[in-house]
Interface confidence: low
């Protein structure tokens, strides 16, 4: 009984001079924070240089300030006890951890490249002033059909599947318009598809006989061993848009 | 004891570049800022930038801004001074030397010649 | 103000005091606690002699002394010896969180 009461004494006495013991073995432990423990003089609390911090106590070395410069811009002074913090310049957008890096910002509809500021392709879209232009969204997918369509500042609106738009049913979104008893939208979607199918034909012939009178057969051989390539919108420069998959942003402007 | 032995002499063209290296030992590495002097000769000493081992970061004489890296690895508990775009005026003998508001312990110094 | 202004030269003879002074600004010398000396022999690397404005490293000769007014210190060494001859230096940490160097004073021992 005896034993087990000396037992409690010793670790209340240990854990009462814990922080006592502690102090006395590593001094730098009672340095705050915006001071470093300075081994060169005998581990008393020095004051961090100017242009330095110590943002916890018991450092032994402070931290050399974060210099916002160039592209970076002073959002928050450095201070004894707290880095400073950086945002970027107009025209340019935070990147990373802390805004480690600033990119480019580009308009609405369009995406930063390689090449700088591209407008979206046809389909595709971006809201904002940074990030890539995103694919439209395919309405179909989810049996809708587009209510607006999309441009490269905004995204469709699917609304309602035409089966929904029945007389009974009720919508914030217009009627349909009216279609002729009798045909189906399938029926509809096949002569529409029957119909493009015969004018890319017809269109393809008139190029190739033009191509044959105009270049002769070189030509016509040459064409048939180019790569299918993805026809560009007509109403875009060639080089207008930026056609790429997502990936990984370029980091702009890292200092 | 405390030791800073840095790298040896070096000959360079101009608009080369320059890395000298000091490798501390006798002390915690990380526990000490790294200062870089140069002395031109028969000039006094210059400043040219500080690093903190034990985070990285650095700040530099206005001088030297865009030319000057410093860097540590503190696997090996060494320290580099890169100067890039060389100039016949960088001709000097370049020192690290240990300390935060003074230099407390220097290393040998290291002649870097710059020459076409 | 890129450098702290010292004398070029100062000498003395054996047994005297000299007195180098550093006149800086208000954004170093009279900003910083880290006001320091070196002694600087041809061929060596620099040394620290004086730190905080007056404080000496262990192993340093009691005969070199620093003191701070204003936005001037001074460093002052009393019983002049041979080996005294070198060049001095001081330098002080900036408000701007970079370190600059005096133009450096050149002690002759007559």
């Known amino acids: 009984m005896g034993n087990s009461c000396y037992n409690i004494v010793a670790t209340l006495l240990l854990v009462l001079n814990f922080e006592r013991t502690r102090s006395l073995q590593d001094p730098c432990s009672n340095c705050p924070a915006g001071t470093f423990c300075d081994n060169n003089r005998n581990q008393i609390c020095s004051p961090c240089p100017p242009n330095s911090f110590s943002s916890a106590g018991g450092q032994r070395t402070c931290d050399i300030c974060r210099q916002c410069k160039g592209v970076f811009r002073t959002r928050k002074e450095c201070s004894s006890t707290s880095n400073a913090e950086c945002d970027c310049t107009p025209g340019f957008h935070c990147l990373g951890a802390g805004c480690s890096m600033c990119e480019q910002d580009c308009k609405q509809g369009q995406e930063l490249t390689k090449k700088g500021c591209k407008d979206c392709c046809f389909g595709t879209f971006n809201d904002q002033k940074r990030g890539i232009c995103r694919p439209w969204t395919n309405c179909s997918l989810d049996g809708k059909s587009v209510l607006v369509n999309g441009t490269k500042e905004r995204d469709v609106v699917c609304g309602p599947s035409p089966a929904d738009l029945s007389p009974g049913a009720s919508s914030v979104t217009p009627p349909a318009p009216a279609r002729e008893p009798g045909h189906s939208p399938q029926i509809i979607s096949f002569f529409l598809a029957l119909t493009s199918t015969a004018l890319l034909f017809l269109l393809f012939f008139l190029t190739l006989r033009f191509s044959v009178v105009k270049r002769g057969r070189k030509k016509l051989l040459y064409i048939f061993k180019q790569p299918f390539m993805r026809p560009v919108q007509t109403t875009q420069e060639e080089d207008g848009c930026s056609c790429r998959f997502p990936e990984e942003e370029e980091g702009g402007c890292e200092l | 004891q405390v030791q800073l032995v840095q790298s040896g002499a070096d000959v360079k063209k101009p608009g080369a570049s320059v890395k000298v290296s000091c490798k501390a030992s006798?002390?915690?590495?990380?526990?000490?800022?790294m200062h870089w002097v140069r002395q031109a000769p028969g000039q006094g000493l210059e400043w040219m930038g500080i690093i903190n081992p034990s985070g990285g970061s650095t700040s530099y004489a206005q001088k030297f801004q865009g030319r000057v890296t410093m860097t540590r690895d503190t696997s090996t508990s060494t320290v580099y001074m890169e100067l890039s775009s060389l100039r016949s005026e960088d001709t000097a003998v370049y020192y690290c030397?240990?300390?935060?508001?003074?230099?407390w312990g220097w290393g040998q110094g290291t002649l870097v010649t710059v020459s076409s | 103000q890129s450098v702290l202004t010292q004398p070029a030269s100062v000498s003395g003879y054996p047994g005297q005091s000299i007195t180098i002074s550093c006149i800086g600004s208000s954004s170093d010398v009279g900003f910083s606690q880290y006001v320091s000396w070196y002694q600087h022999h041809p061929d060596r690397p620099p040394k620290l002699i004086i730190y905080d404005v007056s404080n000496r490293p262990s192993g340093v000769s009691d005969r070199f002394s620093g003191s701070k007014s204003g936005n001037t210190a001074s460093l002052t060494i009393s019983g002049l010896q041979a080996e005294d001859e070198a060049d001095y230096y001081c330098s002080s940490y900036r408000s701007s969180g970079t370190y600059v160097f005096g133009t450096g004073t050149k002690v002759t021992v007559l």
């Open positions: 030397a240990r300390g935060v508001g003074e230099l």
């Open positions: 006798g002390y915690t590495f990380t526990s000490y800022y």
